[in-house]
């Protein structure tokens, strides 16, 4: 039951995280005009990964897309790439994890297959979350660098006669959404990996009872396991399924390896 809960929760957390990563990537407020210690402007500038916007005091908002690809800073391109990779991996991870969910039955899919799929999706979520966190962090670092550079040259002008105010940008809402979403996806991925351990076919479920037959040392295993000859020779007892799909209760009724003292 704990495995199902962990897997289900991991899936939900990752789903929320990926939705957040998509939202952050689409948001326009990656960087927003710094209003502190600046002249009070009648416009509010903010920028996203895909376009920059200006909101006038009347409420009128005008956005312009970055219609150039080659003219954009390499860092911005890198952030875009990281976010897109994160979304793609996350989306594939979600697709895989749906089929891996223990509560969903698809034909006679074996638990080992579900375990592998759970692990795969977990890893995908972890990488997706890391991509999002990395993308947001790179952008934040870029902002911090530019912020202090523009603070150093807050006013530039010809002989001090004409002043040009340099608009400073600070962290926008999308950065926080991205960090949180990336973190959630990462946590969801870890949960999926933990769930995978519980789903994976275990080692010997019951302590074998040795019956010493004439001249042979045979360890009899419970149904579903092949007998291993040579006491203690098979250190990694592999579970060999007898073809029949077990019910959920049957699977959960076996003690796990953690039950052994």
């Amino acid at each position: 039951m704990a495995v199902t809960a962990c897997q289900g929760l991991g899936f939900v957390v990752s789903l929320i995280g990926i939705a957040g990563i998509i939202a952050a990537t689409c948001m326009d407020q990656w960087s927003t005009q710094d209003l502190y210690n600046n002249p009070v402007t009648a416009v509010f500038n903010y920028q996203g990964l895909w376009r920059s916007c200006v909101r006038e005091s009347s409420g009128f908002t005008e956005c312009r897309g970055y219609f150039t690809l080659l003219g954009l800073p390499a860092m911005l391109q890198a952030v875009r790439a990281l976010m897109i990779v994160g979304i793609v991996l996350g989306a594939i991870g979600l697709l895989v994890s749906i089929f891996a969910l223990k509560c969903i039955r698809i034909g006679s899919m074996e638990d080992s297959a579900k375990a592998n799929m759970t692990l795969t999706s977990g890893i995908m979520f972890i990488v997706s979350g890391l991509c999002a966190i990395a993308g947001v962090s790179v952008f934040a670092n870029m902002l911090v660098t530019n912020f202090w550079m523009s603070t150093a040259n807050m006013y530039t002008g010809m002989g001090g006669m004409v002043q040009t105010v340099q608009t400073r940008y600070t962290f926008g809402a999308a950065l926080f959404v991205g960090w949180v979403a990336g973190g959630l996806t990462l946590i969801g991925g870890v949960m999926m990996c933990i769930a995978c351990r519980g789903l994976a076919p275990e080692e010997t479920n019951y302590k074998a009872v040795s019956y010493h037959a004439s001249g042979h040392s045979v360890a009899y295993k419970p149904g579903g396991f092949k007998a291993s000859t040579g006491f203690g020779s098979n250190t990694k007892n592999k579970k060999i399924y007898d073809g029949g799909a077990r019910t959920e209760d049957e699977v959960q009724s076996y003690p796990s390896k953690h039950d052994y003292v």
């Epitope: 002249p39 402007t41 009648a42 416009v43 500038n45 903010y46 200006v54 006038e56 312009r64 004409v162």
Partner: antibody
Framework: DVQLVESGGGLVQPGGSLRLSCAAS????????MHWVRQAPGKGLEWVAY????????YYVDKLKGRFTVSRDNAKNSLYLQMNSLRAEDTAVYYC?????????????WGQGTLVTVSS | DIVMTQSPPTLSLSPGERVTLSCKSS????????????LAWYQQKPGQAPKLLIY???TRESGIPDRFSGSGSGTDFTLTISSLQPEDFAVYFC?????????FGGGTKVEIK
């Protein structure tokens, strides 16, 4: 047709108070920011204050902060300017103007103005 | 505060003449976010309220004749009346629309010669 009508002006003694009103019609008042601008006799225009459609933010010219208060009642389609501790230099024609939408913050419609005279 | 300087203070001209009014701001009115200039021009006739002619430094307000045109960027702006009409004799003000307080220039009076 957009119409802005100011009222409440008149003669007031120095140190006195006055409340100007601006009645708006012909447009959705609650969707627009509004300005007060004044013009001393024979002088140029001086921007006084701005109030956004939702009453926040509000901006004032520094020298009038604390003495003048701008407010609005969207239900009544009205804009107000409360003027306290009036001085002789506050004598001017006071205009209310609409903050135009998609006109780069320009003031697209103006009222005819109301004259405020501060004199003893 | 942004200081708006208009020149000349007075212009004496005849109908049909071309008029060029100048406006300079102490700070750039070009917003980097959208590369637009936030400057407006107004016309005021005696006893009347000001009327918006040009916004965004160069965009004519609807209903304004095309003889009026605005140009310039950053700190230097110009209002041009291609052929002065009798109804154009008035005072013209420029206004900073980017920074609060939204300061006006001192005005240029265009009078009949």
């Amino acid at each position: 047709d957009v119409q802005l009508v100011e009222s409440g002006g008149g003669l007031v003694q120095p140190g006195g108070s006055l409340r100007l009103s601006c009645a708006a019609s012909g447009f959705t008042f609650s969707s627009f920011g509004m300005h007060w601008v004044r013009q001393a006799p024979g002088k140029g225009l001086e921007w006084v204050a701005y109030i956004s459609s939702g009453s926040s933010p509000i901006y004032y010219v520094d020298k009038l902060k604390g003495r003048f208060t701008v407010s609005r009642d969207n239900a009544k389609n009205s804009l107000y300017l409360q003027m306290n501790s009036l001085r002789a230099e506050d004598t001017a024609v006071y205009y209310c103007a609409r903050a135009g939408y998609a006109v780069r913050n320009a003031l697209d419609y103006w009222g005819q103005g109301t004259l405020v005279t501060v004199s003893s | 505060d942004i200081v708006m300087t208009q020149s000349p203070p007075t212009l004496s001209l005849s109908p049909g003449e071309r008029v060029t009014l100048s406006c300079k701001s102490s700070q750039s009115l070009l917003n980097v976010g959208n590369q637009k200039n936030y400057l407006a021009w107004y016309q005021q006739k005696p006893g009347q309220a000001p009327k918006l002619l040009i916004y965004g430094a160069s965009t004519r307000e609807s209903g304004i004749p095309d003889r009026f045109s605005g140009s310039g960027s950053g700190t230097d702006f110009t209002l041009t009346i291609s052929s002065l009409q009798p109804e154009d004799f008035a005072v013209y003000f420029c206004q900073n629309d980017l920074f609060y307080p939204l300061t006006f220039g001192g005005g240029t009076k265009v009078e009949i010669k």
